[in-house]
Interface confidence: low
């Protein structure tokens, strides 16, 4: 079969695709790219006039097992002088990832795909100011 | 793969750590959260270090749609409104797993994928470099 | 803009059947879905189909017991259901989407019908 153009039918299912039980789809998490690091300005969650710490959390029912957040220092902005400046707002940036969960019930197991929401580092911005009547 | 801990009482057979392919349902654990950051906040436009939030799709990868982050300035937007450019607007970066279609095309089979995706972006100090 | 208008819901014993219709307008679509919401619980896939007719996909639930189908020349999706459960009480929405990919995430959906209730009682 020809595959039609998208935006009409849906690109049609090859015949060399791996059967799968209703319900299911197969995940194999050897990580593609396993390997790229993150090249990030350095300390920018130190020098960030919106300034964060990273805390790890670990689940070991979860793939990946560790997963790195970042909560903000403060409630406003760091100044030119060093000083919070409380006119202005931290506020966190966040980024849906996927993980896997192993889920155990009794001697069975099984997995699910599951979305999680990271906070990756914080931004420093005008507060909206709302004028009561 | 990673360890996990074991009903004591189950038989020997099942393997401690994540197997190399499993599988898993298909109904996503909080699959309904807003993926669309214009849709979620407006940090983007309110930042001093403002940005532009670009779509990169992908039918092959799930999510297909995911939102990339361009620093709008150089520099950081001060009390007056202008861009002081003795503070830099950098973005913040994130590894994320998607999941990616493998063999191409087939709808139920995938593998992990980690990609690196601009977030957002943070107005920063410099680095100074003094040349003697 | 795809307007989407479902009818066929309704009371019905546990082991009875039920048709659901769904009557779509509008611009072309890669393929329709019915996904339903049960009371208290989030909206969940139940059976999709391609705009060619020629796929069809079933949340494991339904497996069996529902059969998707459309009529091409009316622009008509039905949903088929048979030895209905209490456990398939829900609103049952049709909804229309772009691309095959991952049929059974109810984001990926971008219109919506308003919904036809389906309770299965004795």
């Known amino acids: 079969r020809k595959i039609p153009k998208v935006g009409h039918t849906f690109f049609q299912k090859p015949e060399s695709c791996p059967p799968v039980p209703g319900g299911s789809m197969k995940l194999d998490i050897g990580i593609i790219n396993e390997n790229q690091r993150v090249s990030m300005s350095r300390n920018i969650e130190s020098r960030s006039t919106s300034p964060w710490n990273y805390t790890v959390t670990w689940d070991p029912n979860r793939y990946p097992s560790e997963v790195v957040q970042a909560q903000c220092r403060n409630l406003g902005c760091i100044n030119a002088q060093g000083k919070e400046d409380i006119s202005m707002n931290s506020v966190p940036i966040q980024q849906e990832t996927l993980v896997v969960r192993r889920k155990h019930q009794g001697c069975s197991v099984s997995f699910q795909l599951e979305k999680v929401l990271v906070t990756v580092g914080c931004t420093c911005v005008t507060p909206v100011i709302h004028h009561v009547q | 793969g990673i360890t996990i801990p074991r009903n004591p009482g189950c038989p020997n057979s099942e393997d401690k750590n994540f197997p190399r392919t499993v599988m898993v349902n298909l109904n996503i654990h909080n699959r309904n959260t807003n993926t669309n950051p214009k849709r979620s906040s407006d940090y983007y436009n309110r930042s001093t270090s403002p940005w532009n939030l670009h779509r990169n799709e992908d039918p092959e990868r799930y999510p297909s749609v995911i939102w990339e982050a361009k620093c709008r300035h150089l520099g950081c937007i001060n009390a007056d409104g202008n861009v002081d450019y003795h503070m830099n607007s950098v973005p913040i970066q994130q590894e994320i797993l998607v999941l990616r279609r493998e063999p191409p095309h087939c709808p139920n089979s995938f593998r992990l994928e980690k990609i690196l995706v601009s977030v957002g972006c943070t107005c920063v100090t410099p680095i100074v470099h003094h040349v003697a | 803009e795809v307007q989407l208008v479902e009818s066929g819901g309704g009371l019905v014993q546990p082991g009875g059947s039920l048709r659901l219709s769904c009557a779509a307008s509008g611009r072309t679509y890669d393929a329709m879905g019915w996904l339903r919401q049960a009371p208290g619980k989030e909206r969940e896939f139940v059976a999709a189909i391609s705009g060619s007719g020629d796929d069809t996909y079933y949340a494991d639930s339904v497996k069996g017991r529902f059969t998707i189908s459309k009529d091409n020349s009316k622009i008509t999706m039905y949903l088929q259901m048979n030895s209905l459960r209490p456990e398939d009480t829900a609103v049952y929405y049709c909804?229309?989407?772009?691309?095959?990919?991952?049929?059974?995430?109810?984001?990926?959906?971008?219109?919506w019908g308003q919904g036809t209730l389906v309770t299965v009682s004795s």
């Open positions: 909804a229309t989407r772009r691309g095959l990919y991952y049929v059974w995430d109810s984001n990926d959906y971008e219109n």
